[in-house]
Amino acid sequence: RPSFSLVEDTTLEPEEPPTKYQISQPEVYVAAPGESLEVRCLLKDAAVISWTKDGVHLGPNNRTVLIGEYLQIKGATPRDSGLYACTASRTVDSETWYFMVNVTDAISSGDDEDDTDGAEDFVSENSNNKRAPYWTNTEKMEKRLHAVPAANTVKFRCPAGGNPMPTMRWLKNGKEFKQEHRIGGYKVRNQHWSLIMESVVPSDKGNYTCVVENEYGSINHTYHLDVVERSPHRPILQAGLPANASTVVGGDVEFVCKVYSDAQPHIQWIKHVEKNGSKYGPDGLPYLKVLKAAGVNTTDKEIEVLYIRNVTFEDAGEYTCLAGNSIGISFHSAWLTVLPAPGREKEITASPDYLE
């Protein structure tokens, strides 16, 4: 499938610090009413930690103690059940770790399996089990800088999951992306997590961010769009190439042709030949012989060089590098001069009884 250029996202301007969210199912901590529960935030290098319960900021109170990376709940009640999160804020990014707390009367030694089942229910997004947003396929969101030809359509997608089902909104260059921000607006399909912009123009260049959020968290992804406009032109041949060359009989020579073309160029090497002593046909066009053309197994580099081995006097003459694309044709020519080999008798071209 024909595609578009993709550049690894390595040399971009710094953005807002990214946020990492766990995609795996959260751990479940079980306690009986009245028991105390202590949970450690399982994040490394946690400089500043903030806590939430069911998406709401959690502060210390007479039963909740927050010390460093530990959360303590004293005298747990069923109302303490829910989805908890600790977020570690760092200078370069932030990371969130989720866990479930289940305070229930019916605890027995066989309930560990049930707890696991509960976690699986959470993953399958049962209405009872909540989950912060997550990307359904992170691998497809790694390359982020895209060049698209003007006048075509761009589709951004950020497929995600979560429970409750997250909502999606879009930013352009960090600000809310409104319909009136571009001629023709844009189209959104929330069920496909997609945004479409038709007939893109250079002013559509920029950073497009999808923000996917529910009450338990928020994730975002930024696409960097470049809209490429091009004035079409026929191939450009490097000045001075091919260059005139001279060699002796039996020697080797090479002509080089450097071709620059946006559209796929078709390159040929042509020799001007004589027919019946004439270089031109009755129609005034030159007699030409194609020596080399791009084939299925020929690379651009191979076709740009014409090698002539073991040169003879017949190889002398005009050689043309011709390059064409969908827009037009360009050509440059060069001359090959063939000199007699030193120390050899010159070829006799006159009558046999004439001796030098």
């Epitope: 499938r1 024909p2 595609s3 578009f4 993709l6 497809k140 969101m141 390359k143 895209h146 698209v148 030809p149 003007a150 006048a151 075509n152 359509t153 761009v154 589709k155 951004f156 997608r157 950020c158 497929p159 399909r189 069920q191 496909h192 997609s194 479409i196 696409y223 769009l225 406009e229 091009r230 004035s231 079409p232 946006d262 559209a263 796929q264 160029p265 694309n325 969908s326």
Partner: antibody
Framework: EVQLVESGGGLVQPGGSLRLSCAAS????????ISWVRQAPGKGLEWVGR????????NYADSVKGRFTISADTSKNTAYLQMNSLRAEDTAVYYC????????????????????WGQGTLVTVSS | DIQMTQSPSSLSASVGDRVTITCRAS??????LAWYKQKPGKAPKLLIY???FLYSGVPSRFSGSGSGTDFTLTISSLQPEDFATYYC?????????FGQGTKVEIK
């Protein structure tokens, strides 16, 4: 206003050749493309091939590969369908259509959509 | 090649009816599906692209849905000018392929 006008159709013998033209106005080929689609009498639509101006590439259906060639003269805003070694089963109305790409940045491919079509030209291959 | 199968092949309906045409792909085409409408002796016209996006100028009574292998074109309230043949077409695979068409006739 975008317009596409096909010409060059007619009656040709099996094994013969024909060149169809598609003259476009109201847009330039520079960034988009031209597709050819045919429709045999009383039958459905069959995609023949596509010329993509951005990189000059062409793609063909297996049924015509090696026999048909799509080209374009962007200075004239005209696309061509050169049809060689014609067979009876190539008999159809041939349409050219302006084609644009939907660049899906998530899955990294281009979906091709034909939004403006010509009126069609009939090619009859018969002895 | 990816085969596209439309159903039904033809249907009879009255003005004002809600009409649904389905299109099934022989393999996953994601959302890379378009719908076209063709009247006898005329060129096809684009209705829907990318499975669910209405092409500009197309009346809002037309809608598309689906992804993967199963797609639907719905006409919410059939109008006299809607009696025509409808084709689905995928372009995720090479070559692009059309469904065999669904003819919508007047009951």
């Amino acid at each position: 206003e975008v317009q596409l006008v096909e010409s060059g159709g007619g009656l040709v013998q099996p094994g013969g050749s024909l060149r169809l033209s598609c003259a476009a106005s109201g847009f330039t080929f520079t960034s988009t493309g031209i597709s050819w689609v045919r429709q045999a009498p009383g039958k459905g639509l069959e995609w023949v091939g596509r010329y993509w101006a951005w990189d000059g590439s062409t793609n063909y259906a297996d049924s015509v590969k090696g026999r048909f060639t799509i080209s374009a003269d962007t200075s004239k805003n005209t696309a061509y369908l050169q049809m060689n070694s014609l067979r009876a089963e190539d008999t159809a109305v041939y349409y050219c259509a302006r084609t644009y790409g939907i660049y899906d940045l998530y899955v990294d491919y281009t979906e091709y959509v034909m939004d403006y079509w010509g009126q069609g030209t009939l090619v009859t291959v018969s002895s | 090649d990816i085969q596209m199968t439309q159903s039904p092949s033809s249907l009879s309906a009255s003005v004002g009816d809600r009409v649904t045409i389905t299109c099934r792909a022989s393999q996953d085409v994601d959302t890379s599906l378009a719908w076209y409408k063709q009247k006898p002796g005329k060129a096809p016209k684009l209705l829907i692209y990318s499975a669910s996006f209405l092409y500009s100028g197309v009346p809002s009574r037309f809608s598309g849905s689906g992804s993967g292998t199963d797609f639907t074109l719905t006409i919410s309230s059939l109008q006299p000018e809607d009696f025509a043949t409808y084709y689905c077409q995928q372009s995720t695979g090479h070559p692009q392929t059309f469904g065999q068409g669904t003819k919508v006739e007047i009951k």
